[in-house]
């Protein structure tokens, strides 16, 4: 059996994963979600509108993507933030903007960060600002794993199908 | 043999690769284009130089990528912008930088934004600036669809093969 | 059985999975490396920890990824930089931050830049800063090619598995 007789460290480096055993070898799980523009102070992912989709077994659960079968996936997400200049009467405090893709698997009692991007913005007088963050990478995931996002700066999101999205596809 | 009969420079740019023997079903359309560095005030995509290529049916038409067959594609693009400090005599106006991948399809009478990134830059005295934008995602595309880009801030592009590019591959 | 006998923390990092019986044709070389957080003034890539892995022939050599077989690969990398405000007594000099994925191939006697991102940062008083850079694209690579990274601003890297990474997968 895979991994049997390996030392813990060999097992750790090997990280043998189940590969998709598919009756239809052409199944290619993929998903592309967009942020719901009607929800201004939250980030709700939708797959039933515009160019968003769920294919070959991807499913949504509590604003998370459910991994349809064990294997390696490329996971990606983008957000765009914007803000107006602060008013001269207001104090300009720095804004911490961050976006993270997280994995929740009951193996762990917490969400594991997979992808993180961060930015400090210092709004100035008469100076509107815009900032984009994108990231993506390949991860070994297990059937039923949950992929979700966490964002700092949600009120500043520019919610449109081409600016705020989250997706994954099996390799 | 790959590369035989090519001039050294053609071999260097084409880098014809040994392809593993593939049945037709394993055709994997892919393209990687780079911004033509000889065109300073426009963004013209090239596939016949450096590490750029068109494979398995992708083609260029009117500076757009033509989708060779219907399916899901990962589409990506990057730009890098730079600028010098403004001169003390000049007024510093904010610069709006943006890069967008667009879809033109017979289904719609207009260009649909697929991927958008944006940035406001405020040039300062003695302060050269640099900014990178990248994005990519999976989309369901139809044979004959056209993928193009629109960029605000073209005069500020840092045109090199590793900084300004546009590509796609079938999943 | 996978994971049996591992401590919870070893199991957490190992995430040993059963691999199913695969025909040779379904091999999918993939790699995801993370920056070693114990090395603060260098960027050393690791594949034997957290969610990093080498699959189906990828290997590490001199901090480079070795391409296991000729073909088209999607190559990606991310870095996150951070810094504190400069002290009032110090002079604030601009910081050039850059991250590049490079190819070293026996075809060329030098490192070829594949992916480059750049940023100028101007630290201010009382102003900590954060900046993320990501890029990825498809390239035709040859068995034995070496993929490496070069980074300007290494002392400012935020070294964690979700912020600094480098990977590739065969298409």
């Amino acid at each position: 059996l895979p991994g049997v007789g390996l030392t813990p460290s060999a097992a750790q480096t090997a990280r043998q994963h189940p590969k998709m055993h598919l009756a239809h070898s052409t199944l290619k799980p993929a998903a592309h979600l967009i942020g719901d523009p009607s929800k201004q102070n939250s980030l709700l992912w939708r797959a039933n509108t515009d160019r968003a989709f769920l294919q070959d077994g991807f499913s949504l659960s509590n604003n998370s993507l459910l991994v349809p079968t064990s294997g390696i996936y490329f996971v990606y997400s983008q957000v765009v933030f914007s803000g107006k200049a602060y008013s001269p009467k207001a104090t300009s405090s720095p804004l911490y903007l961050a976006h993270e893709v997280q994995l929740f698997s009951s193996q762990y009692p917490f969400h594991v960060p997979l992808l993180s991007s961060q930015k400090m913005v210092y709004p100035g007088l008469q100076e509107p600002w815009l900032h984009s963050m994108y990231h993506g990478a390949a991860f070994q995931l297990t059937q039923g794993d949950q992929l979700s996002t966490h964002t700092d700066g949600i009120p500043h999101l520019v919610l449109s199908p081409s600016t705020v999205f989250f997706g994954a596809f099996a390799l | 043999l790959p590369g035989v009969g090519l001039t050294p420079s053609a071999a260097q740019t084409a880098r014809q690769h040994p392809k593993m023997h593939l049945a037709h079903s394993t055709l994997k359309p892919a393209a990687h284009l780079i911004g033509d560095p000889s065109k300073q005030n426009s963004l013209l995509w090239r596939a016949n130089t450096d590490r750029a290529f068109l494979q398995d049916g992708f083609s260029l038409s009117n500076n757009s990528l033509l989708v060779p067959t219907s399916g899901i594609y990962f589409v990506y693009s990057q730009v890098v912008f730079s600028g010098k400090a403004y001169s003390p005599k000049a007024t510093s106006s904010p610069l709006y930088l943006a890069h967008e991948v667009q879809l033109f399809s017979s289904q719609y009478p207009f260009h649909v934004p697929l991927l958008s990134s944006q940035k406001m830059v405020y040039p300062g005295l003695q302060e050269p600036w640099l900014h990178s934008m990248y994005h990519g995602a999976a989309f369901q595309l139809t044979q004959g669809d056209q993928l193009s880009t629109h960029t605000d801030g073209i005069p500020h592009l840092v045109l090199s093969p590793s900084t300004v590019f546009f590509g796609a591959f079938a999943l | 059985l996978p994971g049996v006998g591992l401590t919870p923390s070893a199991a957490q990092t190992a995430r040993q999975h059963p691999k199913m019986h695969l025909a040779h044709s379904t091999l999918k070389p993939a790699a995801h490396l993370i920056g070693d957080p114990s090395k603060q003034n260098s960027l050393l890539w690791r594949a034997n920890t957290d969610r990093a892995f080498l699959q189906d022939g990828f290997s590490l050599s001199n901090n480079s990824l070795l391409v296991p077989t000729s073909g088209i690969y999607f190559v990606y990398s991310q870095v996150v930089f951070s810094g504190k405000a400069y002290s009032p007594k110090a002079t604030s000099s601009p910081l050039y931050l850059a991250h590049e994925v490079q190819l070293f191939s026996s075809q060329y006697p030098f490192h070829v830049p594949l992916l480059s991102s750049q940023k100028m940062v101007y630290p201010g008083l009382q102003e900590p800063w954060l900046h993320s850079m990501y890029h990825g694209a498809a390239f035709q690579l040859t068995q034995g090619d070496q993929l490496s990274t070069h980074t300007d601003g290494i002392p400012h890297l935020v070294l964690s598995p979700s912020t600094v990474f480098f990977g590739a997968f065969a298409l």
């Epitope: 077994g57 349809p68 | - | 995430r15």
Partner: antibody
Framework: EVQLVESGGGLVQPGGSLRLSCAAS????????IHWVRQAPGKGLEWVGY????????NYNEKFKGRATISSDKSKNTAYLQMNSLRAEDTAVYYC???????????WGQGTLVTVSS | DIQMTQSPSSLSASVGDRVTITCRAS??????VAWYQQKPGKAPKLQIY???HRYTGVPSRFSGSGSGTDFTLTISSLQPEDFATYYC?????????FGQGTKVEIK
């Protein structure tokens, strides 16, 4: 050949508990989740939740959260459904199912009938 | 939760007939719908997934279509072994939910 065999059904008093078993064979047990789905007499199908035997990951239908616990034992290639505080409306045939892709119930056991009655 | 409403709840048909069963989702579910066949005293069997893809071993007379909220299962030429109850299921979001069933009986 994939086989799933449920057991543990029978008559249960209202307020009581049940523990159903699902013995799996014919595939690598840790490579797929096990779902539980129930069907009340003459009614439709209702998804209860799933467990991944590899990492003990679970996901429940909110309707059953707090009352249902799905678990598995890798050494026995067996999944379990524990349900507490049973009511008459929990009377149903309980099926375990193994998917191909996560939400597609491709392989089913024969079902086991649970009757909640005093 | 997403409600799946099937119609009709039952129908009578003869061998060789073309039979159509419809399923409506309470909100758009893209193409994330599966269909199952169940015979009395037996477990359900997966027939169609992702609205229109036949599962392994399912005869070509079975086809599915639809996207958004409206979906259809069609049996082009009913065979004796097709008399059963058919359920649709949305696999767009949890909790995955089923329709109440359509019983196909012999006329």
């Amino acid at each position: 050949e994939v086989q799933l065999v449920e057991s543990g059904g029978g008559l249960v008093q209202p307020g009581g508990s049940l523990r159903l078993s699902c013995a799996a064979s014919g595939y690598t047990f840790t490579s797929y989740v096990i779902h539980w789905v129930r069907q009340a007499p003459g009614k439709g199908l209702e998804w209860v939740g799933y467990n991944n035997p590899y990492n003990d990951g679970t996901n429940y239908n909110e309707k059953f959260k707090g009352r249902a616990t799905i678990s598995s034992d890798k050494s026995k290639n067996t999944a379990y459904l524990q349900m507490n505080s049973l009511r008459a409306e929990d009377t149903a045939v309980y099926y375990c199912s193994r998917p191909t892709m996560l939400p597609w119930f491709a392989y089913w056991g024969q079902g086991t009938l649970v009757t909640v009655s005093s | 939760d997403i409600q799946m409403t099937q119609s009709p709840s039952s129908l009578s048909a003869s061998v060789g007939d073309r039979v159509t069963i419809t399923c409506r989702a309470s909100q758009a579910v893209s193409s994330a719908v599966a269909w199952y066949q169940q015979k009395p005293g037996k477990a359900p069997k997966l027939q169609i997934y992702s609205a229109s893809h036949r599962y392994t071993g399912v005869p070509s007379r079975f086809s599915g279509s639809g996207s958004g909220t409206d979906f259809t299962l069609t049996i082009s030429s009913l065979q004796p072994e097709d008399f059963a109850t058919y359920y649709c299921q949305q696999h767009y979001s949890t909790p995955w939910t089923f329709g109440q069933g359509t019983k196909v009986e012999i006329k």
